[in-house]
C-alpha cells in the first residue's frame, strides 16, 4: 500500500501523458486523480510505465471502483490487465465482445492464464451461452479453447455456433467432450449434401454412435484411418467387416498398420476370421 502524501506543488496531473513516467510511486499516488485516470485509460498503454508504476495506477482504480471496474474502463485496460488477479476479474461485468477482444489481444501468443480463463468464464456466463461470434473470437486466440471446457459447459453451446469450429479446435478434445459436441454438429450440418456433410462432420465423429457410422458406410465417404482411430470403441465394435470396408473405402488397407492399436484391435478381436479374411490383409482375430 502506498502511503498518503500531499502532491508537490505544480505536479498535479492534468492529463495522463508521458511526463508521468518520471514520477515516483508516491508522486503518482498523490498527484494522479483516479477519476482522471479512469477517463483517460486509453492513454496508459501508449506510455512505458514500469510494473511498479502500473501497480500504483491499479491501486487507484481499485480505490475508485471497489465493487469492480465499469466496462468503459475495462475495455481500455490494455497491458494493465496483466496486473489483474482472477479475484479482481470476478467483480467485473463484461458484456461487449470488443472488450473481450481487446483484453485477449494483450495476452496474445501466451498460454491461457488464470486471468484470461476467469475473464472468458465471466463473459460467457454473462451472455448465457457460447454464441457463434464469441466462439469465433475465442478459438481464434486459443485454438484449444473448446476442449478446455467441461462436457457440462459444452452443453450450453448452441448448434449454430458449431459452424465456427475448425478441425484443429477439436484436436485436444476427449471422448466425453465429443459426445456432447457431435449431436450439435449433426444438427448444425443436417441440411448439407452427403460429401459436404462428411467434410464438416468428420472432426466430430469421435462422438458418433454406431447407427450413424453404419449410415455413413452407405455413402461412399472413404473415411481416413486417422478419423477411424478416433471413433468411440463402443460405436466401432458392432460394425461388420463389410460395413468397415465400405466406411474406409480405399483406406481399409490401413487397418493392417493399426491392428495392435485401439479401437482396431478390439474390433478385429470380435470379428469372425472368415470375414476378416475377405479383406485380404492378413488380420488375425
Amino acid at each position: 500500500e502506498v502511503e498518503k502524501t500531499a502532491c508537490p506543488s505544480g505536479k498535479k496531473a492534468r492529463e495522463i501523458d508521458e511526463s508521468l513516467i518520471f514520477y515516483k510511486k508516491w508522486e503518482l499516488e498523490a498527484c494522479v486523480d483516479a477519476a482522471l485516470l479512469a477517463t483517460q485509460m486509453d492513454r496508459v498503454n501508449a506510455i512505458p510505465f514500469t510494473y511498479e508504476q502500473l501497480d500504483v495506477l491499479k491501486h487507484k482504480l481499485d480505490e475508485l471502483y471497489p465493487q469492480g471496474y465499469p466496462e468503459s474502463v475495462i475495455q481500455h485496460l490494455g497491458y494493465l490487465f496483466l496486473k489483474m488477479s482472477p479475484e479482481d476479474i470476478r467483480k467485473w461485468n463484461v458484456t461487449s465482445l470488443e472488450t473481450l477482444k481487446a483484453l485477449l489481444e494483450v495476452n496474445k501468443g501466451h498460454e491461457m492464464s488464470p486471468q484470461v480463463a476467469t475473464l472468458i468464464d465471466r463473459f460467457v456466463k454473462g451472455r448465457g451461452q457460447l454464441d457463434k461470434d464469441t466462439l469465433d473470437t475465442l478459438t481464434a486466440f486459443y485454438p484449444g479453447y473448446l476442449c478446455s471446457l467441461s462436457p457440462e459447459e459444452l452443453s450450453s453451446v448452441p448448434p449454430s455456433s458449431i459452424w465456427a469450429v475448425r478441425p484443429q479446435d477439436l484436436d485436444t478434445c476427449d471422448p466425453r467432450q465429443l459426445d456432447v459436441l457431435y449431436p450439435k454438429a449433426r444438427l448444425a450440418f443436417q441440411n448439407m449434401n452427403g460429401s459436404e456433410y462428411f467434410v464438416k462432420i468428420q472432426s466430430f465423429l469421435g462422438g458418433a454412435p454406431t447407427e450413424d457410422l453404419k449410415a455413413l458406410s452407405q455413402q461412399n465417404v472413404s473415411m481416413d484411418l486417422a478419423t477411424f482411430m478416433k471413433l468411440r470403441t463402443d460405436a466401432v465394435l458392432p460394425l461388420t467387416v463389410a460395413e468397415v470396408q465400405k466406411l474406409l473405402g480405399p483406406h481399409v488397407e490401413g487397418l493392417k498398420a493399426e491392428e495392435r492399436h485401439r479401437p482396431v484391435r478390439d474390433w478385429i478381436l470380435r470379428q469372425r476370421q472368415d470375414d476378416l479374411d475377405t479383406l485380404g490383409l492378413g488380420l488375425q482375430g
Epitope: T233, D234, L237, R262, G285
Partner: antibody
C-alpha cells in the same frame, strides 16, 4: 457382481512351469465386451501385464514374455489359465487375474496369489 | 512398445492438499489412459479410464486430464484413505504397459 479368484501352487521350482487358474463367478467368461488378463507384481515393484485371452481363444501376450507364456480359456468351467514356462527367481511375484472391460480398463481384479520360484 | 513414465516416483502430502501426478507416454496414445490406486497387500483399483472418465463408485475428488502423450491425475483434496501407490496404464497399444507408480505418503 463379477468376482475373480486365482488358484494354483504358491511354490514353483526353477526351470519348471508355473500354472495358475482364474475362476470367474457372477458373470461369463464368454462376454462380448471383455478380455481376461494376467498381471503380475514382483515384491516391492510395479505392475507388469502378462497377456490376455478372449473367449474365442484369441490371445495377446507381452512381447517380453511371449516365448514362455500360454493363456487358455475353458468356457464350460468359466475359467481361464496361465502357464509360464522355464521360470526363474525373477518370476517370483503376486499374480493377479483381471477383467479388461473394453470401454474402461481392468475394472475387476482377483485378490492375487503369491508365487515364489525357489528350489 | 510404448513406454509410460510417471512422475514423481513418490511424494509427501498432507490431508487436504491438492495432489497432481503426471504420466507421459513415449508416443501418442490418444485418450487411452487409465489410472489405478493400489494399497499395500491389495489388488489395484481402477479410478479413471479414457484419460478423464471417473469409474463408478470413485469419489469426485479424483480427476484425470490429458490426451496424446501427457496426462495428469489430480486429487483435489487428499483424504486419509488416499495414501497409496498410483499407476497409469495405456490400453491403446497391445503391449498394455503400466507406469512405474507414484507412492503418495503422509507428510
Amino acid at each position: 457382481q463379477v468376482q475373480l479368484q486365482e488358484s494354483g501352487p504358491g511354490l514353483v521350482k526353477p526351470s519348471e512351469t508355473l500354472s495358475l487358474t482364474c475362476t470367474v463367478s457372477g458373470g461369463s467368461v464368454s462376454s462380448f465386451t471383455d478380455t481376461w488378463s494376467w498381471i503380475r507384481q514382483p515384491p516391492g515393484k510395479g505392475l507388469e501385464w502378462i497377456g490376455y485371452i478372449y473367449y474365442s481363444g484369441s490371445t495377446n501376450y507381452n512381447p517380453s514374455l511371449k516365448s514362455r507364456v500360454t493363456i487358455s480359456v475353458d468356457t464350460s468351467k468359466n475359467q481361464f489359465s496361465l502357464k509360464l514356462s522355464s521360470v526363474t527367481a525373477a518370476d517370483t511375484a503376486v499374480y493377479y487375474c483381471a477383467r479388461d472391460f473394453v470401454l474402461s480398463g481392468f475394472d475387476i481384479w482377483g485378490q492375487g496369489t503369491m508365487v515364489t520360484v525357489s528350489s | 512398445d510404448i513406454q509410460m513414465t510417471q512422475s514423481p516416483s513418490s511424494l509427501s502430502a498432507s490431508v487436504g492438499d491438492r495432489v497432481t501426478i503426471t504420466c507421459r507416454a513415449s508416443q501418442s496414445i490418444s485418450s487411452y489412459l487409465n489410472w489405478y490406486q493400489q494399497k499395500p497387500g491389495k489388488a489395484p483399483k481402477l479410478l479413471i479410464y479414457a484419460a478423464s472418465s471417473l469409474q463408478s463408485g470413485v469419489p469426485s475428488r479424483f480427476s484425470g486430464s490429458g490426451s496424446g502423450t501427457d496426462f495428469t491425475l489430480t486429487i483435489s483434496s487428499l483424504q486419509p484413505e488416499d495414501f497409496a501407490t498410483y499407476y497409469c496404464q495405456q490400453p491403446y497399444d497391445a503391449s498394455y504397459t503400466f507406469g512405474g507408480g507414484t507412492k503418495v505418503e503422509i507428510k
